[in-house]
C-alpha cells in the first residue's frame, strides 16, 4: 500500500542504508523513494539540531516488518517511501530554497538576473544537478548575483549551509523540462568510454538506458549481451560519465550496445520501472519470499504489492509447479538489479512495477467557446489536466478546453459540439503548454464517445456539460494527469481559492493565445451572479465567478475548460468555463458549470460505459 | 505538526448554552474547514457542522440547525462550536476534526459536555 | 440523508485470524468513504479512505475494498493493537453519515 503521511517529531531508530544531506523532507522522501532498498526515512531539518554536521541529514532505511520503531525527536520528520505510489511517484522537485546554501563541485559560475535564471542555466546544463544563487543583497558585493552550477557524486549536495541571502536548488531536468533534447538512439556494437560511475546487471539495453536516465551522473552506458565474449561481464551495464558530457571515444565492439540518458528529454520521461517479462531468464538475488501462483503476470503483480520485493522469476520446472500454480521466487539485491542473470531456463523473470506511474491509486490528490483575460503566462506541469480540443477540417483549430477525470475520460462543456457533434473532426491534445508546440507529429487523442447532457439544449446556457470518452486510455505523466471531481456534497461548499485556465482570447475581440493562460479569480455568490445577469437564469447547478471591477475572467476559447479551487489541500474541479456576457467586463461575472451538482451523473455515465468508475474521483 | 487543541469540560443545566473552543496550530488555518463532530457517552459519531475561516461560510446539519453556531476567530486560528437550549440527550464528547480533503485526518482531543440539572 | 449501516456492533476474533467489517450505505456513495479507528478514550483517527489510501502508521494487513453501497474493512491478521471501535463514514453527500461502529475484541 501507498503511505503518504509524514511524522513530525519524529525518528525512525536503526535500519539504515544510506545517508545524504536534503534541504527539505520532501526531497529526502523522493530519494528514499528512488533507492532500491529504501522503505523508511528521517530527516532532521536545520531547527531539529545544533550537530551542524548533522543538520539537513536525510536518512534512509530499510526494515524487514516495513516498520521501524520511532523516538520523539523534536523538529525531525519522518515518513514512508512513495513506492508504490503510483503517480505521486517523481524524480521532479521544482522548489526553490532560499536562505540555504547548497554546497557541491562547483564547475560554472555565472551573472544572472534571477534565481529562476539560475535553475533554467542548471536545468540547460549536462552536468549540472543541483545550483545556488546569491541574490542581490549577498553581503559580499563581488558574489551578487552569482549562478554556481553544482554536481557531486550522490548527485545530492557534500553539505547545507544555511547563508543568508542565498538560494538554492535543483536542476528540472527530472521533469522533463531540459532544452537541451536527447539521444534516443541505440548504438549495437558499440562501445562508449571514458569514466564508468557504476555497474549492474540487466537483462537487456533498454533496462539499462533507464538505470542510466534516473541515476544521478549517469550521462551514458555500454551495456554487454548474453553472447558477450567474457562469461563474467555478459548482462553488465556500465553507467558511464565524462567531463564534456558526450563520450570521449567509442569503439566497434560485437555485442555490446551503447546509448544515452533520456533524463535530457523534453515533455517526457521513461518511467523509472521496467515493466516488460522475460522469458527463459533467471534473475538471482537475495529470497524474500516463494508464492505458488498462477502465471507470471500473477508473480509480477506479487512482487509488486510486496513492497521489498525488486525482481522475480516464476519458475515452469515440474517439481515447481502443483495443479495450476507454480513457484514464484521474490527478490531483492543491495542495488536493486539481479545479482546473477540466466539463460535458457524453464523460467520467466521481471521486475516489480513499485516504482512505474500508471497505478490506479488516486493521483488526483497529488497539486494547480469562452480566452483568459487578463491572467499570466503557466507553466508545465502546473495544470495537468487541461486539455485542448481541436478539430480538424480543412485547418486544424483549437475551439475549447477540456479537463482531465481518468485516464479515458475528459469533462468539457456541451456547447463545444454545438455544430461539430462527429467524434472523427476531433483531436485532443493533453500534456501541452505552447500551442505552437502542435505539429503534425504531436500525438493526440481521438473520441470514442461523446456524452452530452440529455437536459442540454444548444444556444441555452442550461445543463452545459459532456463527456468525451477517449478512443485509447492516456497514460498519466507530470504533465498529464487527472484533476480530483468533487463530492456531491460540495454543492453549499465555499471555495476561496480559485482558477482558470485556458488558450482562450485575452481580449473580447482577440485570438487564441498561444500558452496556456491561468487567472486567481474569486467565486461570485448566486445571488449577486443573478443581480447582474438579470435576462437570464442564474440556477443552483450553475457557479458565478470574476471581479466586480472585471479585467479578469474567461473568454472565447476557454470554454469547456476548468475551474478548479484549492479545498482542504486538495485541487477540485469546481466549475467548467460555460458563457458569459463579453469578457471581464465590469459587473459581468463569468458562468461556470457547477460539477457537483452532475456528480451523479458523471459517476453515472462513466460507469454505465465501463462497467466500473474510471475518474480519478478522490476514491 | 497539525494539532488541535480544544477545551475543557463543561457541566450545562437543560436550557443553557455551551460555547466549546478549538485552538489550531501547525497549518494555514484559513485553508481548511474545521469540523465538528460528537459521540454521546457508549455511542457512535455525529456530524455537526463545519465552517470554511477563510470565508466564514458554514454548514450545518439540519438536525442541529437553529440550535447550533460555529464561528471561527482568524486572528487566534481558533474555531468555537454553540450549542442552545441544551437537553440531556446532548451530554456527548465534542470533537472539532479538520479534514484533508474530505475525511477528517486531524482530531481534537475532545470537550466532555454533560447536560444535567 | 445517506444511512450507514455497521451490521455487527461487536466482533471477537483470535490473534492471527482475518477479520472483516461491513459496511452498508442506504445508497450508492461512488467509493466516498472513509474508515476510523478508535480506541478507548481517545479521539477517532483516520484509518483509510478513498482519498488517501491507508494512512501512515497503520500495519499493512489493514485493507479496504467495495463499490457502491457495500463496504469492507478487513484486517489479514487481528493483532492484539487492533482492539478498537471501528467506524465508516460516507462524505458523498451532506451530512456526512458514519456507520454505528464495530467494536473489534480478541477472544
Known amino acids: 500500500g501507498c503511505l503518504t503521511q509524514l511524522y513530525e517529531n519524529a525518528f525512525f531508530r536503526g535500519g539504515d542504508v544510506a545517508s545524504m544531506y536534503t534541504p527539505n523532507a520532501q526531497y529526502c522522501q523522493m530519494r528514499c523513494t528512488f533507492h532500491p532498498r529504501c522503505l523508511l526515512f528521517s530527516f532532521l531539518p536545520a531547527s531539529s539540531i545544533n550537530d551542524m554536521e548533522k543538520r539537513f541529514g536525510c536518512f534512509l532505511k530499510d526494515s524487514v516488518t516495513g516498520t521501524l520503531p520511532k523516538v520523539h525527536r523534536t523538529g525531525a520528520v519522518s515518513g514512508h517511501s512513495l513506492k508504490q505510489c503510483g503517480h505521486q511517484i517523481s524524480a521532479c522537485h521544482r522548489d526553490i530554497y532560499k536562505g540555504v546554501d547548497m554546497r557541491g563541485v562547483n564547475f560554472n559560475v555565472s551573472k544572472v538576473s534571477s534565481v529562476e535564471e539560475c535553475q533554467k542555466r542548471c536545468t540547460s546544463n549536462i552536468r549540472c544537478q543541483f545550483f545556488s544563487y546569491a541574490t542581490q543583497t549577498f553581503h559580499k558585493a563581488e558574489y551578487r548575483n552569482n549562478c554556481l552550477l553544482k554536481y557531486s557524486p550522490g548527485g545530492t549536495p557534500t553539505a547545507i549551509k544555511v547563508l543568508s541571502n542565498v538560494e538554492s536548488g535543483f536542476s528540472l531536468k527530472p521533469c522533463a523540462l531540459s532544452e537541451i533534447g536527447c539521444h534516443m538512439n541505440i548504438f549495437q556494437h558499440l562501445a562508449f568510454s571514458d569514466v564508468d560511475v557504476a555497474r549492474v546487471l540487466t537483462p537487456d539495453a533498454f533496462v539499462c538506458r533507464t538505470i542510466c536516465t534516473y541515476h544521478p551522473n549517469c550521462l551514458f552506458f555500454t551495456f554487454y549481451t548474453n553472447v558477450w565474449k567474457i562469461e563474467s561481464q555478459r548482462n553488465v551495464c556500465l553507467l558511464k560519465t565524462s567531463e564534456s558530457g558526450t563520450p570521449s571515444s567509442s569503439t566497434p565492439q560485437e555485442n555490446t550496445i551503447s546509448g544515452y540518458s533520456l533524463l535530457t528529454c523534453k515533455r517526457t520521461l521513461p518511467e523509472p520501472c521496467h515493466s516488460k517479462i522475460y522469458p527463459g531468464v533467471d534473475f538471482g538475488g537475495e529470497e524474500l519470499n516463494v508464492t505458488f501462483v498462477k502465471g507470471v503476470n500473477v508473480c509480477q503483480e506479487t512482487c509488486t504489492k510486496m513492497i521489498r520485493c525488486q525482481f522475480f522469476t516464476y519458475s515452469l520446472l515440474p517439481e515447481d509447479c502443483k495443479e495450476e500454480k507454480c513457484k514464484c521466487f521474490l527478490r531483492l539485491s543491495m542495488d536493486g538489479s539481479p545479482t546473477r542473470i540466466a539463460y535458457g531456463t524453464q523460467g520467466s523473470s521481471g521486475y516489480s512495477l513499485r516504482l512505474c506511474n500508471t497505478g490506479d491509486n488516486s493521483v488526483c490528490t497529488t497539486k494547480t467557446s469562452t480566452r483568459i483575460v487578463g491572467g499570466t503566462n503557466s507553466s508545465w506541469g502546473e495544470w495537468p489536466w487541461q486539455v485542448s480540443l481541436q478539430v480538424k477540417l480543412t485547418a486544424q483549430r483549437h475551439l475549447c478546453g477540456g479537463s482531465l477525470i481518468g485516464h479515458q475520460w475528459v469533462l468539457t462543456a456541451a456547447h463545444c459540439f454545438d455544430g461539430l457533434p462527429l467524434q472523427d473532426v476531433w483531436r485532443i491534445y493533453s500534456g501541452i503548454l505552447n500551442l505552437s508546440d502542435i505539429t503534425k507529429d504531436t500525438p493526440f487523442s481521438q473520441i470514442k464517445e461523446i456524452i452530452i447532457h440529455q437536459n442540454y439544449k444548444v444556444s441555452e446556457g442550461n445543463h452545459d456539460i459532456a463527456l468525451i470518452k477517449l478512443q485509447a486510455p492516456l497514460n498519466y505523466t507530470e504533465f498529464q494527469k487527472p484533476i480530483c471531481l468533487p463530492s456531491k456534497g460540495d454543492t453549499s461548499t465555499i471555495y476561496t481559492n480559485c482558477w482558470v485556465t485556458g488558450w482562450g482570447f485575452s481580449k473580447e475581440k482577440g485570438e487564441i493565445q498561444n500558452i496556456l493562460q491561468k487567472v486567481n479569480i474569486p467565486l461570485v455568490t448566486n445571488e449577486e451572479c443573478q443581480k447582474r445577469y438579470q435576462d437570464y437564469k442564474i440556477t443552483q447547478r450553475m457557479v458565478c465567478a470574476g471581479y466586480k471591477e472585471g479585467g479578469k475572467d474567461a473568454c472565447k476559447g476557454d470554454s469547456g475548460g476548468p475551474l478548479v479551487c484549492k479545498h482542504n489541500g486538495m485541487w477540485r474541479l469546481v466549475g467548467i468555463t460555460s458563457w458569459g456576457e463579453g469578457c471581464a467586463r465590469r459587473e459581468q461575472p463569468g458562468v461556470y458549470t457547477k460539477v457537483a451538482e452532475y456528480m451523479d451523473w458523471i459517476l453515472e455515465k462513466t460507469q454505465s460505459s465501463d462497467g466500473k468508475a474510471q475518474m480519478q474521483s478522490p476514491a | 505538526q497539525v494539532q488541535l487543541v480544544q477545551s475543557g469540560s463543561e457541566l450545562k443545566k437543560p436550557g443553557a448554552s455551551v460555547k466549546v473552543s478549538c485552538k489550531a496550530s501547525g497549518y494555514t488555518f484559513t485553508d481548511y474547514e474545521m469540523h465538528w463532530v460528537r459521540q454521546p457517552p457508549g455511542k457512535g459519531l455525529e456530524w455537526i457542522g463545519a465552517i470554511h475561516p477563510g470565508s466564514g461560510g458554514t454548514a450545518y446539519n439540519q438536525k442541529f440547525k437553529g440550535r447550533v453556531t460555529i464561528t471561527a476567530d482568524e486572528s487566534t486560528s481558533t474555531a468555537y462550536m454553540e450549542l442552545s437550549s441544551l437537553r440531556s440527550e446532548d451530554t456527548a464528547v465534542y470533537y472539532c476534526?479538520?479534514?484533508?480533503?474530505?475525511?477528517?485526518?486531524?482530531w481534537g482531543q475532545g470537550t466532555l459536555v454533560t447536560v444535567s440539572s | 440523508d445517506i444511512q450507514m449501516t455497521q451490521s455487527s456492533s461487536s466482533f471477537s476474533g483470535s490473534l492471527g485470524d482475518r477479520v472483516t467489517i461491513t459496511c452498508k450505505a442506504s445508497e450508492d456513495i461512488y467509493n466516498r468513504l472513509a474508515w476510523y479507528q478508535q480506541k478507548p478514550g481517545n479521539a477517532p483517527r483516520l484509518l483509510m479512505s478513498g482519498e488517501t489510501g491507508l494512512e501512515a502508521g497503520f500495519h499493512l494487513r489493514f485493507s479496504g475494498s467495495g463499490s457502491g453501497k457495500d463496504y469492507t474493512l478487513s484486517i489479514a491478521s487481528l493483532q492484539t493493537e487492533d482492539v478498537a471501535t471501528y467506524y465508516c463514514?460516507?462524505?458523498?453527500?451532506?451530512?456526512?453519515?458514519f456507520g454505528g461502529g464495530t467494536k473489534l475484541e480478541i477472544k
Open positions: 476534526a479538520r479534514p484533508y480533503g474530505y475525511p477528517f485526518a486531524y
Open positions: 463514514q460516507q462524505y458523498w453527500s451532506t451530512p456526512w453519515t
